[in-house]
């Protein structure tokens, strides 16, 4: 808490400059008054404050403003804003994508902090959804932004929203998020024809079922092998080895390489052996030729 | 986290110069270039001298054309070059500078004396 003194004379502050970096912290909370400080807000960043005099100026925003700052101040908050606690930002209302961009440039280039957190949480509740340009700038700033979403929040994601999303944003995403993101990329990328589709779909498939597996195996996609490998294997089991090699196509030959590894692995086990032998690979586990394969998956499903 | 080391303070009879010099253990990330501080007894931390990143200077009304900050790049420190010295100089003079995530930092500070 800052000592009250008297502004000595002389000092009063007449307008936000740079003359205010060579005030002790008490002459600030003396001589510079909350409203001037407010309207003038917008100089503040410019001039070479300490945080200890930020934390000075910050309390006489407070004072002047206990239910929360206005978005006038908000905006030009600039370094000031990382004195801010959560509390304080819970207190107000951003409805504007300027604003949010100028404090989450005082962030840039590090990880997201608690207070910006809360602030993307009040921007977006108040928008009611993530739109397209709220998530292209946020993307922008945070790439693993979408992934930090909860299932529930990702809900309220517009399908055209999903135009922002970059290959990256997807990078730390868990399969019960691409589950939510998967429908509304195909929704959104629905009327592009089918190599540019699945240019598009290509990061989402982690979220995709079997159905929509086979479908993409009758169009010549060539899906790699780091995508196959981040596929459902739920979504991978009932494909057939001739819709897994339609599938890959050139790339079927990477199967050899992560037969270890899920979803090959389980894949492999479900397969006839004679047909994994047709593709030439090597590959071992396959059920032996003369087994009966029981879906006991199938039988609990109809008793 | 970079250190801050001050140095040359001392005991100067009025109208005496002192030379500080204030060393960084590697290279500052600062968003306010490099200031030199003093703090009396029973007073508050005031800034003395400013050099911004662009090599700007500033300085207090109290010590315009007395004091001179400077940098050496090379050696990774920052000067202050104290002439005409009066006895309301003495403090504990700090070098400081604040980071691009909310902190200030500050060395040990270094003891001037102007006394006869």
């Known amino acids: 808490e800052v000592e009250k003194t008297a502004c000595p004379s002389g000092k009063k502050a007449r307008e936000i400059d740079e003359s205010l970096i060579f005030y002790k912290k008490w002459e600030l909370e003396a001589c510079v008054d909350a409203a001037l400080l407010a309207t003038q807000m917008d100089r503040v960043n410019a001039i070479p404050f300490t945080y200890e005099q930020l934390d000075v100026l910050k309390h006489k925003l407070d004072e002047l403003y206990p239910q929360g700052y206005p978005e006038s101040v908000i905006q030009h908050l600039g370094y000031l804003f990382l004195k801010m606690s959560p509390e304080d930002i819970r207190k107000w209302n951003v409805t504007s994508l300027e604003t949010l961009k100028a404090l989450l440039e005082v962030n840039k280039g590090h990880e997201m902090s608690p207070q910006v957190a809360t602030l993307i949480d009040r921007f977006v509740k108040g928008r009611g959804q993530l739109d397209k340009d709220t998530l292209d700038t946020l993307t922008a700033f945070y790439p693993g932004y979408l992934c930090s979403l909860s299932p529930e929040e990702l809900s309220s994601v517009p399908p055209s929203s999903i135009w922002a999303v970059r290959p990256q944003d997807l990078d730390t995403c868990d399969p019960r998020q691409l589950d939510v993101l998967y429908p509304k990329a195909r929704l959104a990328f629905q009327n592009m024809n089918g190599s540019e589709y699945f240019v598009k779909i290509q990061s989402f498939l982690g979220g995709a079922p079997t159905e929509d597996l086979k479908a993409l195996s009758q169009q010549n996609v060539s899906m790699d092998l780091a995508t196959f490998m981040k596929l459902r294997t739920d979504a991978v089991l009932p494909l057939t080895v001739a819709e897994v090699q339609k599938l890959l196509g050139p790339h079927v030959e990477g199967l050899k390489a992560e037969e270890r590894h899920r979803p090959v692995r389980d894949w492999i086990l479900r397969q006839r052996q004679d047909d994994l032998d047709t593709l030439g690979l090597g590959l071992q586990g396959g059920i032996p030729n003369g087994y009966l394969v029981l879906d006991l998956s199938m039988q609990e499903a109809l008793s | 986290q970079v250190q801050l080391q001050e140095s040359g303070g001392g005991l100067v009879q009025p109208g005496g110069s002192l030379r500080l010099s204030c060393a960084t253990s590697?290279?500052?990330?600062?968003?306010?270039?490099m200031g030199w501080f003093r703090q009396a007894p029973g007073e508050q931390r005031e800034l003395v001298a400013r050099?911004?990143?662009?090599?700007?200077?500033m300085y207090a009304d109290s010590v315009k054309g007395r004091f001179t900050i400077s940098r050496d790049n090379a050696k990774n420190t920052v000067l202050l070059q104290m002439n005409s010295l009066k006895p309301e100089d003495t403090a504990v003079y700090y070098c400081?500078?604040?980071?691009?995530?909310?902190?200030?930092?500050w060395g040990q500070g270094t003891q001037v004396t102007v006394s006869s």
């Open positions: 050099i911004l990143n662009d090599g700007t200077t």
């Open positions: 400081g500078y604040s980071d691009y995530r909310g902190t200030d930092y």
């Open positions: 590697g290279t500052i990330f600062s968003r306010n270039g």
